[in-house]
Interface confidence: low
């Protein structure tokens, strides 16, 4: 971005003063400002100097320095006030032309920022502004009449209080031109259409404009259709409507329909697609995987997209088991219509309980029949662990049962002392059991595995711990041999990461 010296946003000088504005950039730079006399321009590579040795009120304005080679289009600006006690205003243009409802900038620039508090806009001969004139003032730019109306085409003067009197600018003529209407506004109904062969259909193309001189037509696959036109006038707009009625649609009626309207300002068009099908259809799909895994206690939204014609006569979420006979709550089901033939149905399953694992089926019905989409929901559980001491084939064995989903991995630890949980400093031995025996593995249930640790002699001042972990969390059980038998310590609570 170029840099201007002096490095101030505003500079205030008196008439006759010498002003030097220097701009420096990485490449060549250019100055842009109000057309005014007495400026000299000197450029030297990456810097440019704008100077005058006799500033007048007409030099008041914003001077902008740009770097044409800068792809970001950066610029720097400084605003110069030349405060002339006799000339509070520098008028940059005496005629301003805008269209109705545009903002009209009347470019009377204040030559002294101190005068800002006492400025006003009037019509010539001191007449007040017309009622409902909404305007604002900027000392750098002038007065802006917001959303100018045709009736505000007037001659205006900018007024400033100087020494207890109002000093006017030269007049500025505002011309507000009525907006020549753009292309007509269009509607094509419906936005999409599906019919079974032999059914009736209607397509309505309508256009409106404030001006009566416009044409409208409906075309099918680039062929203009000959349809009688209905004309109307209301809400200060002319309306022309084309209605295509098809008593019995056939495949040749299918395709793209365009509603096109034009006038002197240009052309508007909008399109829709008409699909003719042999019979009713009903398609169910989901962006989600139909096999879902969620940690117990968490929530899940099941979403089904439905494409159907004719419309649905019924729809329903059903729980298919294998656990309780509960059914999804209607408060947790929602339906949204994306458009006429596509809908989304959502089943919210908050804070999932173990009994809510299983199959959820969304069923929908229309004249084309029933369709169903079934989700399989498996819940993930952190491992639960228990250890017992037993003899197998005459050998003393620690038997660890771990239950969770996904299938837990099992690790045995032997550590010194009696403890509820072995820590690193105490560990004497670690055994990983890569292939624990799977005791049960039913769909939608926890997987229970068993790991055996054969111990020839139980060391009494030691702890044997079975740890199990899976992607959800971990659990453990500490086994402490004591002289009167064995003693087990389940942890105070299982490590559980919902």
């Amino acid at each position: 971005i170029p840099v201007i010296e002096p490095s101030v946003p505003e500079l205030v000088v008196k008439p006759g003063a010498t002003v030097t504005l220097r701009c420096v950039g990485n490449g060549s730079v250019e100055w842009d400002g109000p057309p005014s006399p007495h400026w000299t321009l000197y450029s030297d590579g990456s810097s440019s100097i704008l100077s005058t040795n006799n500033a007048t009120f007409q030099n008041t304005g914003t001077y902008r320095c740009t770097e044409p080679g800068d792809p970001l289009g950066g610029s720097a600006a400084i605003h110069l006030y030349v405060k002339d006690p006799a000339r509070p205003w520098n008028v940059l243009a005496q005629e301003v032309v805008v269209f109705e409802d545009q903002d009209a900038l009347l470019p009377c620039l204040l030559t002294d920022p101190v005068l800002e508090a006492g400025v006003s806009l009037v019509r010539v001969r001191g007449r007040p502004l017309m009622r409902h004139t909404n305007y604002s003032f900027s000392p750098w730019h002038g007065f802006t009449i917001h959303r100018a109306k045709f009736i505000q085409s007037q001659d205006y003067q900018c007024s400033a209080l100087m020494g207890g009197r109002k000093v006017m600018s030269i007049s500025i003529r505002l011309k507000v031109q009525k907006v020549i209407p753009g292309p007509p506004a269009l509607t094509l109904v419906p936005a999409e259409l599906v019919r079974i062969r032999g059914e009736a259909a209607q397509i309505v193309c309508s256009a409106s404009s404030v001006d009566v001189n416009f044409d409208v037509f409906l075309q099918h696959n680039n062929t203009k259709l000959a349809i009688p036109q209905q004309s109307d006038f209301h809400n200060n707009r002319y309306q022309k409507v084309l209605t295509l009625n098809l008593d019995q649609v056939d495949f040749q009626h299918a395709g793209n329909y365009s509603c096109v309207a034009s006038n002197v300002q240009g052309k508007h068009s909008t399109s829709m697609f008409f699909r003719v099908v042999e019979s009713a259809y009903l398609n169910l799909s989901s962006e989600q995987n139909l096999i879902q895994e969620v940690t117990v206690g968490e929530g899940l939204n099941l979403k089904v997209m439905v494409e159907a014609y004719p419309g649905l006569q019924g729809f329903n979420w059903t729980y298919l088991g294998p656990f309780s006979d509960h059914q999804p709550e209607p408060k947790l089901a929602n339906a949204t219509t994306k458009d006429t033939y596509r809908h989304t149905f959502t089943l919210s399953l908050p804070r999932l309980k173990p009994s809510e694992a299983g199959r959820y089926s969304f069923l929908a019905r229309n004249p084309g029949g029933w369709r169903a989409l079934t989700f399989e929901l498996t819940l993930r559980y952190p491992p639960e662990v228990s250890v017992i001491w037993t003899f197998i084939n005459g050998s003393g064995t620690l038997l660890c049962a771990a239950s969770g989903y996904p299938q837990p991995n099992v690790t045995w630890l032997q550590c010194s002392g009696h403890t509820d949980r072995c820590d690193e400093a105490q560990v004497l031995q670690v055994w990983d059991d890569p292939y624990p025996e799977v005791l049960s593995q039913e769909p939608f249930h926890k997987v229970t595995v068993q790991s055996l640790l054969t111990v020839e002699t139980l060391e009494h001042n030691q702890t044997y711990e079975c740890r199990a972990h899976n992607s959800v969390g971990s659990g453990s059980w500490a086994f402490i041999p004591i002289s009167a038998g064995a003693h087990t310590h389940p942890p105070d609570e299982f490590l559980f990461t919902p």
Epitope: F315, W317, Q327, P330, N334, A335, T336, T337
Partner: antibody, heavy 126, light 107 residues
């Protein structure tokens, strides 16, 4: 036959608590999907939804009145009770209870008041 | 909260006239809209639910249409017993909100 009937005081003093009871028959609020709501209507004005209670004791309140309203149910008596604290003359209205349900398809979003009580007029005045 | 703007607030019509009442929601309510009829001194009666489904026992001259934010109740041929006040209700989102009502009077 489904019927609902509201009962409660016809006159309440400002700052007092209003307790209204809706006694219903012909359906059970233990039935899956069933709900009961309260609606009021100031004289000559529009309806305003106050609160709903569902078969599973799920409760919803109008946020503009939430800190003043409590809805509860006694399924053994087939009753729903609405209490409204800190009554003000602007709360003068006919208070209705209405049933929500049953539902043609168990999970379709049809959740409208299909049967209404006759309403009870409550005047708040000192 | 979703605002329901009902129009007109009142209308005069004759027996046999076609009457249309509209409800405009401040945001999309996905067809979760009901229409009720209320006669003086009586409780409201459900006419239409889910924007266009006719409640059992309601005459077929009543129909509902619309989608998104714009919904319409139409009485195809006004009968003497139809002179009443009509309300729309959205249940798309809590708090449920009613329209301001439309009073249908005899011309």
């Amino acid at each position: 036959e489904v019927t609902l009937k509201e009962s409660g005081p016809a006159l309440v003093k400002p700052t007092q608590t209003l307790t209204l009871t809706c006694t219903f028959s012909g359906f059970s609020l233990t039935t899956y999907g069933m709900g009961v709501g309260w609606i009021r209507q100031p004289p000559g004005k529009a309806l305003e939804w106050l609160a709903n209670i569902w078969w599973d004791d799920d409760k919803y309140y109008n946020p503009s009145l939430k800190n003043r309203l409590t809805i509860s149910k006694d399924t053994s008596k087939n009753q729903v009770v609405l209490t409204m604290t800190n009554m003000d003359p602007v709360d003068t209205a006919t208070y209705y209870c209405a049933r929500i349900g049953p539902i043609k398809y168990p999970t379709a979003p049809y959740r409208y008041f299909d049967f209404w009580g006759q309403g009870t007029m409550v005047t708040v005045s000192s | 909260d979703i605002q329901m703007t009902q129009s007109p607030s009142s209308l005069s019509a004759s027996v046999g006239d076609r009457v249309t009442i509209t409800c405009l929601a401040s945001e999309d309510i996905y067809d979760n809209l009901a229409w009720y009829q209320q006669k003086p001194g009586k409780a409201p009666k459900l006419l239409i639910y889910y924007a266009s489904s006719l409640q059992d026992g309601v005459p077929s001259r009543f129909s509902g249409s619309g989608s998104g934010t714009d919904y319409t109740l139409t009485i195809s041929s006004l009968q003497p017993e139809d002179f009443a006040t009509y309300y729309c209700l959205q249940d798309s989102e809590y708090p449920w909100t009613f329209g301001g009502g439309t009073k249908v009077e005899i011309k």
